[in-house]
């Protein structure tokens, strides 16, 4: 049975030409996270492996990186980074756990960050 | 549980325009994840067509762009699949599928044989 | 596109054997691969996701491993239901593409 929860950052807002963090937290549950990915719906952005440790799509190689732990780093973002990604968790012997971020980039300089849920 | 179901023409004539719809119960094709085709040719292999996301985005493989569109009626729970201008080389079973997150295919419909034949 | 290409492409085995299908992609994806199983007339079946995580309810028979561009699905004791088609897929990016099939045939 499935018991852990994820925790995201939620509905979160930067400036264009800024950077985010995007990051998603597995809790209650002793399952072994063996590799999480980062994703839009029609792509990869990156993934991090337990045994092969992270790997960058080339279409982000410039303006994403790595961390912190198990998150993603978007920077030089640009109005067309606004949307849905997600975080996927492949756990053992769970199976799989998943996060959404909704992320908004704004050409204006007023941008908050939302408040913190979670996804069951 | 959800079940996905294909429906429409088991023959098109060439030229004309194939039209498919994927009835969904079990699940709110406005709730979450992406909708998709997927065709398979007799005795060939599988190709993704596109998707339509709940939120209603789309997405084209870049072979078929010019000819195909998925759209969707929410208050039936269906998405729908058209394409135009068909010649012989669309003959194909034609699935509806439901995509995860990532870019795999846990739930599939049982599929549709389309035969273009004038 | 990303082009993937299964080898072989039909395979005759036993009861019990083990059998190994190899997928190839154009370009690194990672572990960003499926593997279904396809039996005629019927829809693909989801069996492993993201190169090595088997499907729920998927059995423990089935495997598969590889990243990069080489991918591997194994099924370590063939039983009679095993005898169908078998297909990689590349879930990195669209548009997402297929292997041409590998047809396990019984010997």
């Known amino acids: 049975m499935m018991t852990g929860t994820i925790e995201t950052t939620g509905n979160i807002s930067a400036e264009k030409g800024g950077s985010i963090i995007l990051q998603c937290h597995l809790s209650s549950t002793t399952a072994q996270v063996t590799q999480v990915n980062w994703e839009q719906q029609d792509q990869l952005l990156a993934i991090c492996n337990a045994d092969l440790g992270w790997h960058i799509s080339p279409s982000f190689k410039d303006r994403v990186a790595p961390g912190p732990g198990l998150g993603l780093t978007l920077q030089s973002l640009t109005v067309n980074d606004t949307g849905e990604y997600f975080c996927i968790y492949h756990t053992y012997p769970d199976g799989t756990y998943t996060g959404r971020i909704f992320l908004e980039v704004l050409e204006s300089s007023v941008a908050e960050h939302g408040a913190r849920f979670q996804i069951p | 549980q959800v079940q996905l179901q294909e429906s429409g023409p088991g023959l098109v004539k060439p030229s004309q325009t194939l039209s498919l719809t994927c009835t969904v119960s079990?699940?709110?094709?406005?709730?979450?994840?992406?909708w998709n085709w997927i065709r398979q040719p007799p005795g060939k292999g599988l190709e993704w067509m596109g998707y339509?996301?709940?939120?209603?985005?789309?997405k084209y493989n870049p072979s078929l762009k010019s000819r195909v569109t998925i759209s969707r009626d929410t208050s039936k729970n269906q998405f729908s699949l058209k394409l135009s201008s068909v010649t012989a080389a669309d003959t194909a079973v034609y699935y509806c599928?439901?995509?995860?997150?990532?870019?795999?295919?846990?739930?599939w419909g049982q599929g549709t044989l389309v035969t273009v034949s004038s | 596109d990303i082009q993937m290409t299964q080898s072989p492409s039909s395979l005759s085995a036993s009861v019990g054997d083990r059998v190994t299908i190899t997928c190839k992609a154009s370009q690194d994806v990672f572990t960003a691969v499926a593997w279904y199983q396809q039996k005629p007339g019927k829809a693909p079946k989801l069996l492993i996701y993201?190169?090595?995580n088997r499907n729920t309810g998927v059995p423990s028979r089935f495997s598969g491993s590889g990243s990069g561009t080489d991918f591997t699905f194994t099924i370590s004791s063939l039983q009679p239901e095993d005898f169908a088609t078998y297909y990689c897929?590349?879930?990195?990016?669209?548009?997402?593409?297929f292997g041409q099939g590998t047809r396990l045939e019984i010997k």
């Open positions: 599928a439901r995509k995860y997150y990532g870019g795999w295919f846990p739930v």
């Open positions: 339509i996301s709940y939120s209603g985005d789309t």
């Open positions: 897929q590349q879930q990195y990016s669209t548009p997402w593409t």
């Open positions: 993201s190169a090595s």
């Open positions: 079990g699940y709110s094709i406005t709730d979450d994840y992406a």
